[in-house]
C-alpha cells in the first residue's frame, strides 16, 4: 500500500494548529470498516492517534490531535495538531493498513517568531569617545536558537568581543542576550539583528551613541592623503598627528586606532598607558612621540590581509579622527617561460606559449610583445590565482602560428609598484627545437 | 535595581592584612570600573584606585600603590579590595563606586578598624 | 596630581536661601566636574556631572556651572534635606581627586 507524506517538514508556529498530511489511494468497494490508521511518534513509536474498526479511537497524545474523518474515505488520513509546543518536534509515522499496509514519517518543524530587540547600553552617561561600552541586546520566546549579528550604521559587520547566551525557558522557548563590546568612535549605530533560521525571520535593534563634546572644539587629526604602500612582510608606518595644547600630558589622552570598516580595535593608549596591540601583535606605537602629538602606527610584517582603511581617533578634551589607506603590496617573480610543442618547429605550427610569474600583490597586468615592443593581439588567457597568504601566480597563455622565427615577451605588471617583470622565448630557423640544444 | 553591597565593619590588628568586598547585581558587571575610595573620620575622599572587571585592569592612586591590591570575581560579580601592613592610619570608612568618570552608585562602606 | 580647593569649608543657610558653593582646580579641567552629596552617616551620591548636567532623580533646584578651573554648586531655596557635606571631583585625570568638602547646615 502506497502511503504518501510530503518530504518537506512542516514548519508550524508555537500555539497554532498544523496538519500533518497523509494520503493513500482507497481501492474501489473501499469502506472504513476495513481500515488501520495508526500515527505514532516515529522514535519511540509512542501512540499518537488510531482509527481501527471503523471507529476514531481518538488521541493518545494530550487531546491535542484529530483526524479529518469525513475525508478518510477518500484516502486522507491526515492529522490535525492542536497548540503545537515546542516538545512536539519531530518525526510521526503515518500507518495505513487495509488487506495491505503501508507507512511513511513526516517531520514537524516547531518554530516561534523572536521579539523585537531591546538594546541597553551600560555605562549610558557621560560617554566620551574611548570609552569602552557594553551593549546588549536583548530578544525574547523564540525557537529554534538565533542566529545574531551585529552591524554598525552602514550594515557592515561588527567584529568586536561579542558573547551570546541563549537560555530555555520551560516551554522551550528561547531568550537570546548577545553583548557587544565596543570602543565608542566620535559617535555610531550599532545594529543587532536576531535571525531566526527556520523562519527566515530577521528581528533588529538598534542603538544610536553620540558621546560628549567639549565646548572647546574638536581635535585636528591629520593623516596623509595618499595611501601608505607596504610590501608584503615588511613593516609599515601608518602616520597619524596631532596638536597638542601647552600642558597637555599623556594622563589626558584616548588614542585609538581601529579598522575603519568593522570598528575592530587595532591599538590603543588610554589615561597614560599603552594597552597595546589588539591586532596580532604587530602594532606598536612610537611612545617617545606621543606627547609631541605624533599619534602614528607601526604595523609590522604587513599581510595581504591588512589591506584597508585604519582609522586614527584622537580624543583629548574633545575628539578628532581621521581614516588612512594602506595599500599592500608584493612584487612579481622574473617570469618563467614555456613553450609547447618545443620539438621539431616549422613556420605556420601553432605553439602555446606560457608566461608564469609568482607571489605578487595585487593582481598583476600582463602584456605580450614581440621583438620589437609591438604587441601581440594573438589569443592571449590570463589567469590569476591567489595563495592562502592572498599572493597571486598569474598563468598566461599565448597561442601563436610561427612566423620564420621571432621573439615573444611577456610583461608582468604591478599596478601598484609599477614594477614590470620580463620573460622572453626566441624562436629561430627551422627545423627547431626548445629550449635550444 | 543597581546595588553595591559592602559589609558594615572590620576589626583587624595593626600589621596584618584584610579584603574588603563589593558585591554588585542590578547590572552588567564587566560593563563599569569599579573604583574603591577612602574617607576618614570628618575628613575628605580620597580615590585609591579602580579596577576593569572585565579584564582585570587596575589604576591605582601613587599613594596606595604598595597599600591595596584590586581584584574581582566575575562569577560572583563581587570586586575586592586587598589591604596590607595595616597602621591605625587605614582606619576609615572604604568605599566601593561604579564608574569610570562618574561615581553613579556607591556602596554603604565598610568601617574598617585597626586596633591591637 | 590635579589640586581640588573648596569654599567654604562650611556654612549655614536658612530655608529658602541661595546656597553657592565652590571649587577651584590646579589646571584646566574643561568641564570634567562632578558634584557629590553627603549625608551624615550615608555614602555620596552623584549630584552633577560635566560641570552642569544634574544626575537622573535630583531637584531642579541644585544646578552646577563653569570650566576650566573655576565651578560652582548652586542650590536654589535651601531645603532641610539639604544638610550634607558637599565634595567636588575632577575626572579629567588620574588619580581622581576630590575636594575637601563643603558641609551646609540648616540655620
Known amino acids: 500500500l502506497e502511503v504518501q507524506v510530503p518530504e518537506d517538514p512542516v514548519v508550524a508556529l508555537v500555539g497554532t494548529d498544523a496538519t500533518l498530511r497523509c494520503s493513500f489511494s482507497p481501492e474501489p468497494g473501499f469502506s472504513l470498516a476495513q481500515l488501520n490508521l495508526i500515527w505514532q511518534l516515529t522514535d519511540t513509536k509512542q501512540l499518537v492517534h488510531s482509527f481501527t474498526e471503523g471507529r476514531d479511537q481518538g488521541s493518545a497524545y494530550a487531546n491535542r490531535t484529530a483526524l479529518f474523518l469525513d475525508l478518510l474515505a477518500q484516502g486522507n488520513a491526515s492529522l490535525r495538531l492542536q497548540r503545537v509546543r515546542v516538545a512536539d518536534e519531530g518525526s510521526f509515522t503515518c500507518f495505513v493498513s487495509i488487506r495491505d499496509f503501508g507507512s511513511a514519517a513526516v517531520s514537524l518543524q516547531v518554530a516561534a517568531p523572536y521579539s523585537k530587540p531591546s538594546m541597553t547600553l551600560e555605562p549610558n552617561k557621560d560617554l566620551r569617545p574611548g570609552d569602552t561600552v557594553t551593549i546588549t541586546c536583548s530578544s525574547y520566546r523564540g525557537y529554534p536558537e538565533a542566529e545574531v549579528f551585529w552591524q554598525d550604521g552602514q550594515g557592515a559587520p561588527l567584529t568586536g568581543n561579542v558573547t551570546t547566551s541563549q537560555m530555555a525557558n520551560e516551554q522551550g522557548l528561547f531568550d537570546v542576550h548577545s553583548v557587544l563590546r565596543v570602543v565608542l568612535g566620535a559617535n555610531g549605530t550599532y545594529s543587532c539583528l536576531v535571525r531566526n533560521p527556520v523562519l527566515q525571520q530577521d528581528a533588529h535593534g538598534s542603538i544610536t551613541i553620540t558621546p560628549q563634546r567639549s565646548p572647546t572644539g574638536a581635535v585636528e587629526v591629520q593623516v596623509p592623503e595618499d595611501p601608505v604602500v607596504a610590501l608584503v612582510g615588511t613593516d609599515a608606518t601608518l602616520r597619524c598627528s596631532f596638536s597638542p595644547e601647552p600642558g597637555f600630558s599623556l594622563a589626558q589622552l584616548n588614542l585609538i586606532w581601529q579598522l575603519t570598516d568593522t570598528k575592530q580595535l587595532v591599538h590603543s593608549f588610554t589615561e597614560g598607558r599603552d594597552q597595546g596591540s589588539a591586532y596580532a601583535n604587530r602594532t606598536a606605537l612610537f611612545l617617545d612621540l606621543l606627547a609631541q602629538g605624533n599619534a602614528s602606527l607601526r604595523l609590522q610584517r604587513v599581510r595581504v590581509a591588512d589591506e584597508g582603511s585604519f582609522t586614527c581617533f584622537v580624543s583629548i578634551r574633545d575628539f578628532g579622527s581621521a581614516a588612512v589607506s594602506l595599500q599592500v603590496a608584493a612584487p612579481y617573480s622574473k617570469p618563467s617561460m614555456t613553450l609547447e610543442p618545443n620539438k621539431d618547429l616549422r613556420p605556420g605550427d601553432t605553439v602555446t606559449i606560457t608566461c608564469s610569474s609568482y607571489r605578487g600583490y595585487p593582481e598583476a597586468e600582463v602584456f605580450w610583445q614581440d621583438g620589437q615592443g609591438a604587441p601581440l593581439t594573438g589569443n592571449v588567457t590570463t589567469s590569476q590565482m591567489a595563495n592562502e597568504q592572498g599572493l597571486f601566480d598569474v598563468h598566461s597563455v599565448l597561442r601563436v602560428v610561427l612566423g620564420a622565427n621571432g621573439t615573444y615577451s611577456c610583461l608582468v605588471r604591478n599596478p601598484v609598484l609599477q614594477q614590470d617583470a620580463h620573460g622572453s622565448v626566441t624562436i629561430t630557423g627551422q627545423p627547431m627545437t626548445f629550449p635550444p640544444e | 535595581q543597581v546595588q553595591l553591597q559592602q559589609p558594615g565593619a572590620e576589626l583587624v590588628r595593626p600589621g596584618a592584612s584584610v579584603k574588603l568586598s563589593c558585591k554588585a547585581s542590578?547590572?552588567?558587571?564587566?560593563?563599569?570600573?569599579m573604583n574603591w575610595v577612602k574617607q576618614r573620620p570628618d575628613q575628605g575622599l580620597e580615590w585609591i584606585g579602580r579596577?576593569?572587571?572585565?579584564?582585570?585592569?587596575?589604576r591605582y592612586n601613587q599613594n596606595f600603590r604598595d597599600k591595596a591590591r584590586l581584584t574581582v570575581d566575575k562569577s560572583s560579580s563581587t570586586a575586592y579590595m586587598q589591604l596590607s601592613s595595616l597602621t591605625s592610619e587605614d582606619s576609615a570608612v572604604f568605599y566601593c563606586?561604579?564608574?569610570?568618570?562618574?561615581?553613579?552608585?556607591w556602596g554603604q562602606g565598610t568601617t574598617l578598624t585597626v586596633s591591637s | 596630581d590635579i589640586q581640588m580647593t573648596q569654599s567654604p569649608a562650611s556654612l549655614a543657610a536658612s530655608v529658602g536661601e541661595t546656597v553657592t558653593i565652590t571649587c577651584r582646580t590646579s589646571?584646566?579641567?574643561?568641564?570634567?566636574l562632578a558634584w557629590y552629596q553627603q549625608k551624615p552617616g550615608k555614602s555620596p551620591q552623584l549630584l552633577i556631572y560635566?560641570?552642569?548636567t544634574l544626575e537622573d532623580g535630583v531637584p531642579s533646584r541644585f544646578s552646577g556651572s563653569g570650566s576650566g578651573t573655576h565651578f560652582s554648586l548652586k542650590i536654589n531655596s535651601m531645603q532641610p534635606e539639604d544638610t550634607a557635606t558637599y565634595f567636588c571631583?575632577?575626572?579629567?585625570?588620574?588619580?581622581?581627586?576630590f575636594g575637601g568638602g563643603t558641609k551646609l547646615e540648616i540655620k
Open positions: 563606586a561604579r564608574g569610570v568618570r562618574i561615581f553613579d552608585y
Open positions: 542590578g547590572y552588567t558587571f564587566t560593563a563599569y570600573w
Open positions: 579596577i576593569d572587571p572585565y579584564d582585570s585592569e587596575t
Open positions: 589646571e584646566n579641567i574643561d568641564y570634567t
Open positions: 560635566n560641570a552642569n
Open positions: 571631583k575632577q575626572a579629567y585625570d588620574v588619580p581622581r581627586t
